[in-house]
Interface confidence: medium
């Protein structure tokens, strides 16, 4: 029995004075606690606890379930204990079958013995199956068998406590080990969409998916730069062992412009944290913004092709698109398509394909688009470059030679005189008058230029050339002169195309 210095409170003394006591089933357990300040006896085994306020604990007919630790406590809180084994060949183990452990921690298989003198106290797999090779355990007859450093692979492992009794192996009831996984990585988080664009009053709903090994992962939606608690709804599933999924849905039933911003789905476990964001933009009304992909003033050569291309942002989605020229709507020759197949796409492309344009097809080509909120339009001014065409070349009554040419860009008219029979007309003649005339055709059509020279300047036989040219090409007309005495005659005016 313990001895202490006089004057100090001492722990109670127990009779019989030994740390362990073995009795047979059916025998009497008689324990005496001696202490002037006796308070109580406490009995503990597994999760069971009993108390007795008498200083003598008597169990007349001991049963296996009376196996356990008997503790006597005095008024000073000092105590002394004795462990009693009630040997019952028919009940070698006391069991609490709830067996669970945290990964990488130790866990106790609670199968204390009723007889400490049996041998080979150990664990065995169910149905003769071997235990995992790396499973290590430490037996303790009073507590059970401690499994060291539980592995995730042990989850749902079926096992028995086992002892050898009189040369035979005796098994306890079976235990199923349930392993709670340790967090060895941060949660995996993803969001239904990275960005949202809404009109005021529309519902904003976004779902964050959190995946982890167990349901103890924490998650929440947060508004960046705000502490306000957001309303969220959860659903969760266990997809088998160690595969937990939670969906956290954030909803704003009627979004306002000031709800715009960045929302973060945050998740953490004991290993670390992860987050993902989504951006909400709320506009007071829809919009359309058009961006021309080519210059809105277009120059194209006669007979060539041109594509008029626009990109536009439209929210809500576009409902009507059309291309118009001279108050006529194109029914074909154009296509309209989304810039991407992304669900949140608001950018679209429209292309008008103009083929083998004629000089008469210049003008304003307009793209119109509308949605439920707004209309928008953009105009392209298309100029068709044409080589000059000489419309008239005449000798006027007043003796002037006049040449009228049309083309785009505006033609320049030069005059040349070829004396006699020379083929090359190199001597240039300055015009008396040059005028740009208003065309009676559509706008963006050919420009008409009129140029005149005074024929009295010519004193010899020869040919006068009127040459009209621009960036596209040139055309000439010729006046042949022959002198008869003092009279000058214009003979056979004719044109020659000079490429």
């Amino acid at each position: 029995q313990p001895s202490v210095s006089p004057g100090e409170p001492s722990p109670p003394s127990i009779h019989p004075g030994k740390s362990d006591l073995i009795v047979r089933v059916g025998d009497e357990i008689r324990l005496l606690c001696t202490d002037p300040g006796f308070v109580k006896w406490t009995f503990e085994i597994l999760d069971e606890t009993n108390e007795n306020k008498q200083n003598e604990w008597i169990t007349e007919k001991a049963e296996a379930t009376n196996t356990g630790k008997y503790t006597c406590t005095n008024k000073h809180g000092l105590s002394n204990s004795i462990y009693v084994f009630v040997r019952d060949p028919a009940k070698l183990f006391l069991v609490d079958r709830s067996l669970y452990g945290k990964e990488d921690n130790d866990t106790l298989v609670r199968c204390p013995l009723t007889d400490p003198e049996v041998t080979n106290y150990s664990l065995k797999g169910c149905q003769g199956k071997p235990l995992p090779k790396d499973l290590r355990f430490i037996p303790d007859p009073k507590a059970g068998i401690m499994i060291k450093s539980v592995k995730r692979a042990y989850h749902r492992l079926c096992l028995h406590c086992s002892v050898d009794q009189e040369g035979k192996s005796v098994l306890s009831e079976k235990f199923i080990l349930k392993v709670r996984p340790a967090f060895k990585a941060v949660p995996v988080v993803s969001v239904s969409k990275a960005s949202y664009l809404l009109r005021e009053g529309e519902e904003f709903t976004v779902t964050c998916t959190i995946k982890d090994v167990s349901s103890s992962v924490y998650s929440t939606w947060k508004r960046e730069n705000s502490q306000t608690k957001l309303q969220e709804k959860y659903n969760s599933w266990h997809h088998g062992d160690f595969n937990y999924e939670r969906q956290a849905t954030l909803t704003i039933s009627s979004a306002r412009v000031n709800d715009s911003g960045v929302f973060m789905c945050y998740a953490n476990n004991t290993f670390g944290s992860a987050n993902v964001t989504t951006t909400l933009e709320v506009v007071d009304k829809g919009f359309i913004n058009i961006f021309p992909m080519i210059n809105t003033t277009v120059f194209v050569n006669d007979g060539e092709n041109v594509d008029l291309i626009v990109e536009y942002e439209a929210f809500p989605k576009p409902e009507h698109q059309q291309w118009i020229y001279m108050n006529r709507t194109f029914t074909d020759k154009w296509e309209d398509y989304p810039k991407s197949e992304n669900e949140s796409n608001i950018r679209y492309v429209s292309e008008l394909h103009l083929t083998r344009l004629k000089g008469t097809e210049g003008g304003t080509y307009t793209f119109l688009v509308s949605n439920s909120d707004v209309n928008a339009a953009i105009a392209f001014n298309v100029y068709v470059n044409t080589k000059p065409e000489i419309l008239t070349y005449d000798r006027l009554v007043n003796g002037m030679l006049q040449c009228v040419a049309a083309g785009f860009p505006e033609p320049t008219i030069d005059w040349y005189f070829c004396p006699g029979t020379e083929q090359r007309c190199s001597a240039s003649v300055l015009p008396v008058d040059v005028q740009t005339l208003n065309s009676s055709g559509p706008p963006f059509g050919k420009l008409v230029v009129q140029s005149s020279i005074d024929s009295s300047a010519f004193k010899h036989n020869g040919t006068v050339e009127c040459k009209a040219y621009n960036d596209v090409g040139k055309t000439s007309a010729y006046f042949n002169f022959a002198f008869k005495g003092n009279n000058k005659e214009q003979i056979h005016p004719h044109t020659l195309f000079t490429p």
Epitope: S98, Y100, I176, S216, R246
Partner: antibody, heavy 120, light 107 residues
């Protein structure tokens, strides 16, 4: 001893409010998710709401969503259920229960229940 | 929500009888299935968790089996204190659901 003790039940008129409390003892309260489960007279069990150990995550049955709010105060070891816009069909015995994550999320500890009667 | 269908809704049996109660889930819930016992005027008590694991302190005459969608609670030898109502419950989804209950009465 592990124990849950509900309080706050009583008679309330339709449209009224009531706040139930559940005092926990004998275990590490903040380590466990908690739930409310109800049982209408002569009927079966119906899960109402749940809350994670930290209080960060809450769950509700469709029948009470928007009307009931579950919360907890881990410093006081207490679980709450705020019930607003009560209806006659909310009449039931309300139990609080501890959800044990180890055990297939089973409710391993239950309170004795508190009766809520919604009637005019 | 996952529907849990229990059968039968009630049964009469004698002490010593073997009693079997079945529970069917409307979708695969693996082994996330628990069984409870409730006596009149009392709170439910957990009997079986994880479809087949016996909860601490529950007599070994109770056993559970099954996985996926079909589950069974068996009482190998009915005792007088076992007359009660039994409920199954799925915890696979966060929206927890119970079966309708099976009342075990004395024949």
């Amino acid at each position: 001893e592990v124990q849950l003790l509900e309080s706050g039940g009583g008679l309330v008129q339709p449209g009224g409010s009531l706040r139930l409390s559940c005092a926990a003892s004998g275990f590490s309260f903040s380590s466990y998710a908690m739930s409310w489960v109800r049982q209408a007279p002569g009927k079966g069990l119906e899960w109402v709401s749940a809350i994670s150990g930290t209080g960060g995550n809450t769950y509700y049955a469709d029948s009470v969503k928007g009307r009931f709010t579950i919360s907890r105060d881990n410093s006081k070891n207490t679980l709450y259920l705020q019930m607003n816009s009560l209806r006659a069909e909310d009449t039931a015995v309300y139990y609080c229960a501890r959800r044990n994550d180890f055990w297939s999320d089973a409710f391993d500890i239950w309170g004795q229940g508190t009766l809520v009667t919604v009637s005019s | 929500d996952i529907q849990m269908t229990q059968s039968p809704s009630s049964l009469s049996a004698s002490v010593g009888d073997r009693v079997t109660i079945t529970c069917r889930a409307s979708q695969n819930i693996y082994t996330y299935l628990n069984w409870y016992q409730q006596k009149p005027g009392k709170a439910p008590k957990l009997l079986i968790y994880d479809a087949s694991s016996l909860h601490s302190g529950v007599p070994s005459r109770f056993s559970g089996s099954g996985s996926g969608t079909d589950f069974t609670l068996t009482i190998s030898s009915l005792q007088p204190e076992d007359f009660a109502t039994y409920y199954c419950q799925q915890s696979y989804s966060s929206s927890i659901t119970f079966g309708g209950g099976t009342k075990v009465e004395i024949k």
